[in-house]
């Protein structure tokens, strides 16, 4: 009896050990996605970057979807939200429309429930890029921690798109879950 | 015979609880490095930062291994990966050539199987640093989430690496495990 | 005899299941801290905020206390901390009483068994408002890695306090535990 | 090609000034932080005035401050040397030199003019 | 102020001989060392800057060592061409000061 019982102990262990490692896994949705450069829009105002890349060079997603330029969450739960945005302008690039910028970027939450949008973080610098300089350079960072529920959507909104970094180390934003909700 | 499954019962949450514990915290490789202000290089170029403390300070490290100047993966896994740096010019520090700076940061990884180095984030500003000011100061941030192989190397450069800013709370940067790889 | 250990055994996976559910919360400390508008102090200089929201908008706490404007670690652990603080001024806000700012933030650590205070991270920038432009911004992110203690104490202190942007989606803090210490 | 040419330099007595230029051709003159060396007769090198890219900081050894200005007009791709309260002991050849690039704290210069004469004498 | 000491002050060498000049700095100046030559009626001509590194088109034959106080200058083999004073320079801090110089002479 007492053998049976400790075969089916190693049962319970191995069993877990599986299962407490694949549940471990799949509860931790993941994506980080970088920017689709031959897909930047024009324009000085708040845009929304809807192409980037998934599934190339840095670009990876897992247990949530990317779809129509947003990412959309599949698992509830606390994640932690971060973007990068890196603009940049060359002389040789052409003449700036203004000297005076607003380098912004906003990181949104769309419900589709309750069909409303909200910044969950913003950051950015107003520059002043004059022609002394042949070359202009700015990033920002923001990243936070936030509830996320199960369809919600988020999306990247900049200003002066066209000034952005096109690489995958410059431009690029994502998210993993830290947590359950209690 | 019920009385000893149940005390067997016990053991196996009392040593799954041990085994759960402990398997987390092996899973769960970090590491914090700040400056080392006394070997920081010259040059006004991509330079690499080879000097970080590991062990004195914020300065920390666990499961993973530093050296020759780069953070070394002992753990395949996602993780989150993040720099802070600073950069600071006053009057007194030297006789600053030029007003126009380019102060960057690269986190880059360096594979040792397959030689070769791939710069994972960017980030920095074109600076306009006037004599008419006495002091001048800048940080970036960057951090993202990366796929990391054991072997895999981690490693910072910065441009104008005389002007970085020694101080443990400004100039760092560091990773920590946040998921195995499915 | 084997049936009821099966249903022994299902009972161990069962509360399996749900302790590791509830231990897995219980280890996640979190806080996400938007600051409250109504109450930002005045002056140029290095100056602590104390008015936070921790439970309205995107501000939220667990396993972590809020009190006098400091946010108190409960649990041991390592956490992930990270600051995002925006300034701004407009021309219709008045004259800046100096063209020449220095925008910083100063994420401080407090023991109260040792009392004593220690900057975890700064970062910022020194800026030169002209009053060419009408508007003007600039964001600062810091993030990093730290080993905190139960009891103690993680606090903000910005200069110019009162350019601060008062958006729950601009100018916030927090920290989320990772993982035990050993 | 890259050229420094000097000029001004001349004939002054004691306490009387002075005021040197440098052309520079050739490359991108507002990139560069430059400098004023001389050289008294038979002797070494002298660093006398440096100046940044954007001519908002100016550097001079104990030596010549307060009575030498250095300055430059990026526009006119022109560095100047301004001597006041000259001295004998200012007696030389001054060169306009190019800083190379290089860290942003450290000076050494890979262009050099050929050089002026100033001569303080009465 | 850093002081540059240079020696020997002068030298007498034959074309094909192996010349060292060594410069001395009154203080660490890590590798912030620059050499140039100066061909008499001439001006300055950078050849070495942070120590060792030659600087574009400058022949290999010139080549420059050491950290901290201590420095040497080397030209492998001499040419009639290198008969010139040859100065060094530290660019470590302000005020930038120069040795005194070395006249290299050919026999």
């Known amino acids: 009896g007492s053998q049976h019982i400790r075969a089916e102990k190693a049962m319970v262990d191995g069993s877990w050990l599986d299962l407490a490692k694949r549940s471990k896994l799949e509860a931790q949705p993941f994506a980080h996605l970088t920017i689709n450069a031959t897909d930047i829009p024009s324009g000085s105002h708040k845009v929304s970057l809807s192409s980037w890349y998934h599934d190339r060079g840095w670009g990876k997603i897992s247990n949530m979807t990317f779809s129509n330029g947003k990412l959309i969450v599949n698992q509830d739960g606390f994640y932690y939200l971060y973007a990068n945005i890196c603009f940049r302008h060359h002389e040789t690039s052409g003449d700036l429309a203004t000297e005076y910028l607003q380098l912004m970027v906003y990181v949104t939450k769309t419900s589709i429930k309750i069909p409303s949008s909200h910044t969950l973080m913003k950051g950015g610098s107003t520059k002043y890029w004059s022609g002394n300089s042949e070359f202009h350079f700015y990033s920002i960072n923001v990243g936070g921690f936030f509830k996320l529920r199960s369809g919600e959507e988020i999306s990247i909104e900049v200003s002066n798109p066209s000034l952005l970094d096109p690489d995958q180390d410059a431009t690029y934003f994502g998210a993993f879950k830290v947590r359950d909700i209690d | 015979g019920s009385q000893h499954i149940r005390a067997e019962k016990a053991m196996v949450d009392g040593s799954w609880l041990d085994l759960a514990k402990r398997s987390k915290l092996e899973a769960q490789p970090f590491a914090h490095l700040t400056i080392n202000a006394t070997d920081i290089p010259s040059g006004s170029h991509k330079v690499s930062l080879s000097s970080w403390y590991h062990d004195r300070g914020w300065g920390k490290i666990s499961n993973m291994t530093f050296s020759n100047g780069k953070l070394i993966v002992n753990q395949d896994g996602f993780y989150y990966l993040y720099a802070n740096i600073c950069f600071r010019h006053h009057e007194t520090s030297g006789d600053l050539a030029t007003e126009y700076l380019q102060l960057m940061v690269y986190v880059t990884k360096t594979s040792i199987k397959i030689p070769s180095s791939h710069t994972l984030m960017k980030g920095g500003s074109t600076k306009y640093w006037s004599g008419n000011s006495e002091f001048h100061f800048y940080s970036i941030n960057v951090g993202g989430f990366f796929k990391l192989r054991s072997g895999e190397e981690i490693s910072i450069e910065v441009s104008n690496p005389s002007l970085l800013d020694p101080d443990q709370d400004a100039t760092y940067f560091g990773a920590f495990k946040v998921r195995d790889i499915d | 005899g084997s049936q009821h250990i099966r249903a022994e055994k299902a009972m161990v996976d069962g509360s399996w299941l749900d302790l590791a559910k509830r231990s897995k919360l219980e280890a996640q400390p979190f806080a996400h801290l938007t600051i409250n508008a109504t109450d930002i102090p005045s002056g140029s200089h290095k100056v602590s905020l104390s008015s936070w929201y921790h439970d309205r908008g995107w501000g939220k706490i667990s396993n972590m206390t809020f009190s006098n404007g400091k946010l108190i670690v409960n649990q041991d652990g390592f956490y992930y901390l990270y600051a995002n603080i925006c300034f701004r001024h407009h021309e219709t806000s008045g004259d800046l009483a100096t063209e020449y700012l220095q925008l910083m933030v100063y994420v401080t650590k407090t023991s109260i068994k040792i009392p004593s205070s220690h900057t975890l991270m700064k970062g910022g920038s020194t800026k030169y408002w002209s009053g060419n432009s009408e508007f003007h911004f600039y964001s600062i992110n810091v993030g990093g890695f730290f080993k905190l203690r139960s009891g103690e104490e993680i606090s903000i202190e910005v200069s110019n306090p009162s350019l601060l942007d008062p958006d729950q989606d601009a100018t916030y803090f927090g920290a989320f535990k990772v993982r035990d210490i050993d | 090609e890259v050229q420094l040419v000097e000029s001004g330099g001349g004939l002054v007595k004691p306490g009387g000034s002075l005021r040197l230029s440098c052309a520079a051709s050739g490359f991108t003159f507002r990139n560069y932080a430059m400098s004023w060396v001389r050289q008294a007769p038979g002797k070494g090198l002298e660093w006398v005035a440096g100046i940044s890219s954007g001519g908002t900081y100016t550097y001079y050894p104990d030596t010549v401050k307060g009575r030498f200005t250095i300055s430059r007009d990026n526009a006119r791709n022109s560095l100047y040397l301004q001597m006041n309260s000259l001295r004998a002991e200012d007696t030389a050849v001054y060169y306009c030199a190019r800083r190379d690039y290089g860290d942003v704290y450290e000076w050494y210069f890979d262009v050099w003019g050929t050089g002026t004469t100033v001569t303080v004498s009465s | 102020d850093i002081q540059m000491t240079q020696s020997p002050s002068s030298l007498s060498a034959s074309v094909g001989d192996r010349v060292t000049i060594t410069c001395k700095a009154s203080?660490?100046?890590?590798?912030?060392i620059a050499w140039y030559q100066q061909k008499p009626g001439k001006s300055p001509k950078l050849l070495i800057y942070?120590?060792?590194y030659r600087y574009t088109g400058v022949p290999s034959r010139f080549s420059g060592s050491g950290s901290g106080t201590d420095f040497t200058f080397t030209i492998s083999s001499l040419q009639p061409e290198d008969l010139a004073t040859y100065y060094c320079q530290q660019h470590y801090s302000s005020p930038w000061t120069f040795g005194g110089g070395t006249k290299v002479e050919i026999k």
């Open positions: 203080q660490d100046v890590r590798t912030s």
């Open positions: 942070s120590a060792s």
